[in-house]
């Protein structure tokens, strides 16, 4: 419940041992009390004890002092717990009865007789201070005190504010005396669920998932994520924004790996060749006749330029070369074909077209084949067409991408929604949020995936909107939402009029 009405009985005096009807008790009035607490009534009436009721065992005979007792039978102060917002007003009926029967359970005994009763109506604020009172009638006097306090985890003027300290994924806080949250060190936000990052952690380039942490976003590094990462492979350069490569003095090229003075520093060109500071490696060697190679380090073979065509093999001669032609070809470089379309030279279903009045030919290749005679198969996976780690597979005339889990599309370029896998059980509704799928559960279910069947407090799932107070009803699955001013609906989900600050989502 949200609070407890406590009644402390202190002393009861019935010196003559009389009942309310004027008869005397024999041998004395064995006295127990019935307490009925209900909503405020200007005139107290019979009817249910709407805020609760309790009975005591026999506490004494005729006149006696009631001692405080914290457990077992005859507990004092008496506890009347409630689980609603304390309204601040009440009616209390205290009846003293005589029983001839069982001391411990006098309620069950026949022949109980009323000694006296008192009725108190008024207002009472929640607080720790006891209100003391004494009531007299012609025969009896009762001294007592009472107060209303909030149960554990309930706070505020009407014990309506629930606050339970926690230190988990949903929040990191303790509760203030008024029920407001007090964040644990290192946490902030309305529900103390946002970590305070390492002091100085860059606001845009860094973030954290726990206090005093600084995780860098792509392109940034350093303890405070304030240092950019240069372009991958940047050798002699720096950056002012991520993936940049601004070259240091004397270096050039996309990766600042080309020494602009390479010729002077390294003298790479051999055999009397000329070096110039240019070209893809930062230098170029211009060779003297008879030499070749990147650094002019190779004596030139006459066959080095691959002069023989159509598969002819080259043989070095003293100052020249000679081509040995395969069957069907002739000429100094095997450039002439003796084959015609009549020899069916085109492979893999290629179409033969005659040229030069039938003395030569050309092959037109079908899809997936290339080469002068359509002898080479085209590999359609060489261009790496599959995104997001998809596997490329050649399938006849086409190719397909086999996607990793979570991706789809011809090229695996589309993300599959987390909700597409229907993760919510028991008819729960899935919402794709930034940190993954979240399920909204139907009544009677809870949990991340609506997998937990609720068999206890129907208010535990927090069904009420807009700060309404939830009360459980007569059966476990019933609840009632007590709406704040300006809201209606069985869950207080409808604002009557909308202020500009209302959270609109288009």
């Amino acid at each position: 419940g949200s609070g407890i009405f406590q009644l402390r009985l202190q002393e009861f005096v019935n010196q003559r041992g009389m009942l309310a009807n004027g008869q005397s008790c024999e041998p004395g009035c064995r006295t127990f009390f019935r307490i009925c607490l209900k909503h405020f009534q200007a005139t107290f009436s019979e009817g249910p004890c709407t805020f609760g009721n309790v009975s005591t065992p026999v506490l004494g005979t005729n006149s006696f002092v009631v001692r405080d007792k914290n457990s077992g039978s005859g507990r004092n102060p008496l506890q009347l717990p409630f689980n609603f917002t304390w309204p601040g007003t009440f009616s209390l009926n205290i009846q003293a009865w005589h029983t001839p029967g069982d001391d411990l359970r006098p309620e069950t005994s026949p022949g109980n007789s009323l000694i006296s009763q008192i009725i108190i109506q008024g207002s009472l604020a929640v607080g720790k201070i006891w209100r003391t009172d004494e009531q007299n009638d012609t025969l009896t006097r009762l001294s007592y005190s009472y107060r209303v306090i909030c149960s554990d985890n309930y706070y505020g003027e009407s014990c309506s504010r629930l606050c339970k300290k926690r230190d988990d994924h949903f929040g990191h806080y303790e509760c203030q005396p008024d029920g407001s949250l007090s964040c644990l060190p290192g946490w902030t936000g309305k529900y103390c669920d946002q970590p305070i990052c390492l002091s100085g952690c860059h606001e845009q380039n860094g973030y954290c998932s726990k206090p005093d942490e600084c995780i860098c976003r792509p392109g940034w590094q350093g303890r405070l994520c304030n240092e950019c990462i240069p372009h991958n492979g940047c050798r002699h350069g720096t950056c002012s924004i991520p993936w940049q490569c601004a070259c240091d003095e004397g270096w050039g090229g996309l990766f600042c790996d080309q020494d602009l003075n390479y010729c002077t520093h390294h003298s790479p060109c051999k055999n009397g060749s000329t070096c110039s500071n240019s070209g893809p490696k930062g230098y170029t060697c211009t060779c003297l006749p008879g030499y070749t190679g990147e650094h002019c380090e190779l004596g030139l073979s006459k066959c080095a330029s691959n002069p023989c065509r159509n598969g002819g093999s080259c043989k070095d001669q003293e100052n020249s070369y000679h081509c040995l032609c395969p069957p069907g070809y002739y000429g100094q470089h095997c450039e002439h074909s003796t084959l015609t379309c009549a020899d069916s030279p085109c492979f893999n279903g290629g179409s033969c077209r005659e040229r030069n009045q039938g003395s030569s030919y050309a092959c037109e290749c079908p899809p997936n084949f290339t080469g002068s005679n359509c002898e080479k198969k085209v590999d359609r996976c060489t261009s790496n067409p599959c995104a997001n780690g998809g596997q490329c597979q050649n399938r006849g005339p086409s190719r397909t991408c086999r996607c990793r889990p979570g991706f789809t599309g011809t090229h695996c370029e589309l993300h599959i929604s987390d909700c597409a896998r229907s993760p919510c059980a028991h008819g729960g509704t899935c919402h794709d949020l930034e940190n993954g799928p979240v399920c909204t559960c139907p009544a009677g279910f809870s949990g991340r995936r609506c997998e937990v069947r609720i068999t206890h407090d129907a208010c535990a799932s927090g069904p009420c909107f807009n700060g309404a107070t939830c009360y459980t009803g007569l059966s476990p699955n019933n609840f009632v939402c007590n709406c704040p001013y300006g809201f209606v609906g069985s869950r207080c989900e409808f604002p009557v009029g909308l202020p500009p600050s209302f959270p609109w989502v288009a």
Epitope: G427, T429, H431, V438, F465, G489, R491, F494
Partner: nanobody, 119 residues
């Protein structure tokens, strides 16, 4: 992504009738409350009628006896039947779905449909 699309608005003479529809997509709405709000020029948005997830209805005083809300969960659609229309009913009418996700409250709104009642 939840989307609400209203239709059925238009120009009607005082005393006439209109039926507004709000089709919801991106979720199953049988477990949710749905409602109709309206906003006249220069005024705040106000509740016309809401239907809670348990089926109970909540009408503004100005709508009682003239307007009726109903829902078809199979079609994910909520309707507003408006009879005996008055000039003061002229406004943009918005569909509204309140949702609680992981303890946080979200309010989904449609783009609105204009209702004009002429004298």
């Amino acid at each position: 992504e939840v989307q609400l699309v209203e239709s059925g608005g238009g120009l009607v003479q005082a005393g006439g009738s209109l039926r507004l529809s709000c089709a919801a997509s991106g979720s199953t709405f049988s477990n949710y409350a749905m409602g109709w709000y309206r906003q006249a020029p220069g005024k705040q948005r106000e509740l016309v009628v809401g239907i809670s997830s348990d089926g109970s209805t909540h009408y503004a005083d100005s709508a009682k006896g003239r307007f009726t809300i109903s829902r078809d969960d199979a079609k994910n659609t909520v309707y507003l039947q408006m009879n005996s229309l008055k000039t003061e009913d002229t406004a943009v009418y918005y569909c509204y779905v309140p949702v609680k996700v992981a303890g946080l409250e979200y309010a989904y709104w449609g783009q609105g449909t204009q209702v004009t009642v002429s004298s």
